[in-house]
């Protein structure tokens, strides 16, 4: 679809005569008839296939024709067509004399024709005007013409329909050849596909408008390139959605079981060495001068009874000092000036001479120790209790007081986590290296099966005859609300027809 435009510019009829040679009285009041038709090698009679147009009287004899397009006037003349422009045409322009105001052919005098021109040729669609001038014996007509496409039509033949749009069906403007040119942020054949935020993950993200990045289930982040770990995952990460891959030192389904209590909590004080000994359990090896489960208690250096042979210990700022009894000397009163003759062994210890009587050694009875058997044995000094157990002296023996989760003489045994039946609602308990796991019966969830999740007893559509099904959340059973005319626990029996029982 397009328009052939003809711009009449100047008509010269100096003598003011008709084609017959007769002069116009008083002058030739000139109007034009235009016929546009398909190309003919010889312009032939017949329909103006591309259209016709007439002008009003434009002037007398010789005149210039004003460009009247801006005011909605008739110059240039418009000859619209609604087919593909063929690229060739025949154009006939007639100048007529109108003595009166009636311009109909039948109202004109028999010889009202002033001049007639016919041209044929090729004409491409375009904005540029072609200027032409046709001269006859007595007249001259100067005009220009062009073919342009109608609104929304494009291409060499005005045959490509393209209407710019910015809606659900497309977001584009039209190029001169009729091809679509997508508006910024849109792509695809009809510019219906938004261009997502730069970097938005191709699979995990999408968008409904440009520069947007909406995440698919299981993904998060500005570019939807971060997976969402399993709900409840505490100390873990994921590489695909809903995973919970535990960080170092953590275990369990939700990575909430601490396998590295030492690192995560640093329970040992005063520079003690911490050793992990199971889930949430540890042992502190204290530096000299400290005691307690976490080595939190500072020992007086004299508490370890470093002075032997009855020496008395004095605490000093930078250590301790032993005051030796007569007959002894040395840092810990360990050297004796005594011999067996001096009966140096206490508590029933027996004395043995050494080095030709220059020295001696005491052999102590059970429960006593020291170079002179002066010390009662402390069975807790070797820290025999494992897993942070507390050692207690009980007369001639010792015992370990264990921390929760441990048992055995030396707290060396790990109490089964399942022993205390931690799984609620009949859940099955599984002992794991790093803790326990509960397998819940239908209708329950949570780490300890403590959360009731309703079973949709109606999911299997147990009710007949369009009855409404309700789930009883307290018992996880269903109740059928029967429509009029039906009874039975599943509304399976019509009223009035007793059920046929098999007995």
């Amino acid at each position: 679809s397009g328009v052939f435009q003809l711009q009449l510019q100047e008509f010269i009829n100096e003598r003011g005569v008709l084609a017959s040679g007769r002069p116009c009285e008083p002058g030739c009041r000139t109007f034009f008839r235009v016929c546009l038709k398909h190309f003919q090698a010889v312009v032939s009679p017949g329909p103006c296939t591309f259209g016709t147009v007439s002008t009003p009287v434009l002037g007398t004899n010789s005149f210039a024709v004003r460009d009247d397009s801006s005011g909605g006037g008739r110059n240039p003349l418009q000859l619209p067509f609604n087919f593909t422009w063929p690229g060739t045409f025949s154009l006939i322009i007639e100048a007529w004399h109108a003595p009166g105001d009636d311009l109909r052919p039948e109202a004109l005098p028999p010889d009202a024709l002033i001049s007639k021109i016919a041209i044929q040729g090729s004409l491409a669609v375009g904005q540029n005007w072609l200027l032409d001038e046709q001269t006859s014996t007595l007249t001259r007509l100067r005009y220009s013409y062009r073919v342009i496409c109608s609104d929304n039509y494009y291409g060499d033949n005005c045959s490509r329909l393209c209407k710019k749009r910015n809606d659900h069906f497309g977001h584009y403007v039209c190029q001169p050849d009729g091809n679509l040119s997508c508006l910024p942020g849109w792509t695809g054949e009809y510019c219906q596909q938004p261009i997502c935020l730069s970097g938005c993950h191709e699979q995990n993200g999408y968008c409904s408008k440009p520069a947007e990045c909406l995440c698919r289930p299981g993904w998060q982040g500005r570019l939807c390139n971060e997976c969402i770990p399993h709900n409840g995952c505490r100390h873990g990460t994921c590489s695909t959605p809903w995973q919970c891959t535990c960080d170092e030192g953590w275990g369990g389904l939700f990575c909430d079981q601490d396998l590295n209590y030492c690192t995560h909590h640093s329970p040992c004080k005063n520079g003690a060495t911490c050793s992990n000994s199971g889930q949430r359990s540890y042992t502190c090896t204290c530096r000299p001068g400290y005691t307690g489960v976490d080595c939190e208690l500072e020992l007086s250096e004299c508490d370890s009874n470093p002075c032997r042979n009855g020496g008395s210990c004095k605490d000093q700022e930078d250590g301790y000092h032993c005051l030796c009894p007569p007959g002894y000397y040395g840092l810990h009163c360990e050297h004796s000036t005594l011999s067996c003759a001096d009966s140096p062994c206490f508590n029933g210890g027996s004395c043995r001479e050494r080095n030709q009587g220059a020295n001696y050694a005491c052999e102590c009875p059970p429960n006593f120790t020291g170079s002179n058997c002066e010390k009662k044995v402390d069975r807790c000094t070797s820290n025999p209790c494992a897993n942070g157990g507390q050692c207690l002296n009980r007369g001639p023996s010792r015992m370990c007081r264990c921390r929760p989760g441990f048992t055995g003489t030396y707290c060396e045994l790990h109490v089964s986590d399942c022993a205390r039946n931690p799984c609620a609602h009949g859940g099955t308990c599984h002992d794991l290296e790093n803790g326990l796991m509960c397998t819940c019966p239908a209708g329950f969830s949570g780490r300890r099966c403590e959360v009731r999740t309703s079973i949709d007893a109606c999911a299997s559509s147990p009710c007949f005859n369009r009855a409404t099904c309700y789930t009883d959340l307290s018992t996880d059973t269903f109740v059928c609300n029967c429509p009029y005319g039906f009874v039975g626990s599943r509304c399976e029996f019509p009223v009035g027809l007793p059920p046929s029982f098999p007995w």
């Epitope: 084609a19 017959s20 008839r33 016929c35 038709k37 398909h38 010889v42 312009v43 032939s44 009679p45 017949g46 329909p47 103006c48 296939t49 591309f50 016709t52 087919f83 006939i92 007639e94 007529w96 004109l108 028999p110 010889d111 009202a112 024709l113 007639k116 016919a118």
Partner: antibody
Framework: QVQLVQSGAEVKKPGASVKISCKAS????????IHWVKQAPGQGLEWIGY????????NYNQKFKGRVTFTTDTSTSTAYMELRSLRSDDTAVYYC????????????WGQGTLVTVSS | DIVMTQSPDSLAVSLGERATISCRAS??????????MKWFQQKPGQPPKLLIY???NQGSGVPDRFSGSGSGTDFTLTISSLQAEDVAVYYC?????????FGGGTKVEIK
């Protein structure tokens, strides 16, 4: 009113020529075309061709080309058809008719000229 | 050349009755949405008279009982109510291509 008046009947010998006139009145002769149509006795219509009165462009039916010539005199508003090398099958009534670029068709016809070719 | 075939060759119709004449072209006579088809009436001893142009447009002074229809290759002239003065030979003619050609004619008579 529009009128097309043709010249009178002609009797010609085979091999001769004949020139028929068609004088127009009541309209702007120059703006129109003149067609020529043949009708043999008891037969149908046969188009010979046309001439444009404003630029003298012609279009002939190949069947008659070489034997027929159209001319026009705008000063007298008269069109002419000359047929040469006459044969007996040229015996017919010859009509002139006007036509225009705005497709009404051959809306006005002359009364016809009978040409008899006989030895 | 485009061959125009008319049917029937002759037609006898009672006064006041409908008369229908067909014309078929050997190829389409349409161009740019216009049918280059005309119908003429010729009474004995008279020149032809234009009835219809462009397949369906009435010529000047033609009675309304004459109408034309069709496109492409098939065309029809209808006289809705035959009158005595309608006795004549009717011709179709194409002007799409040179040479312009006429149909063989259909003779319409009173039954």
């Amino acid at each position: 009113q529009v009128q097309l008046v043709q010249s009178g009947a002609e009797v010609k010998k085979p091999g001769a020529s004949v020139k028929i006139s068609c004088k127009a009145s009541g309209y702007s002769f120059t703006a129109y075309y003149i067609h020529w149509v043949k009708q043999a006795p008891g037969q149908g219509l046969e188009w010979i061709g046309y001439i444009s009165n404003y630029n003298r462009a012609t279009n002939y039916n190949q069947k008659f080309k070489g034997r027929v010539t159209f001319t026009t005199d705008t000063s007298t508003s008269t069109a002419y058809m000359e047929l040469r090398s006459l044969r007996s099958d040229d015996t017919a009534v010859y009509y002139c008719a006007r036509d225009y670029d705005y497709d009404v068709g051959m809306d006005y016809w002359g009364q016809g000229t009978l040409v008899t070719v006989s030895s | 050349d485009i061959v125009m075939t008319q049917s029937p060759d002759s037609l006898a119709v009672s006064l006041g009755e409908r008369a229908t004449i067909s014309c078929r072209a050997s190829e389409s006579v349409d161009n740019y949405g216009i049918s280059f088809m005309k119908w003429f009436q010729q009474k004995p001893g008279q020149p032809p008279k234009l009835l219809i142009y462009a397949a369906s447009n009435q010529g000047s002074g033609v009675p309304d009982r004459f109408s034309g229809s069709g496109s492409g290759t098939d065309f029809t002239l209808t006289i809705s109510s035959l009158q005595a003065e309608d006795v004549a030979v009717y011709y179709c003619q194409q002007s799409k291509e040179v040479p312009w050609t006429f149909g063989g004619g259909t003779k319409v008579e009173i039954k």
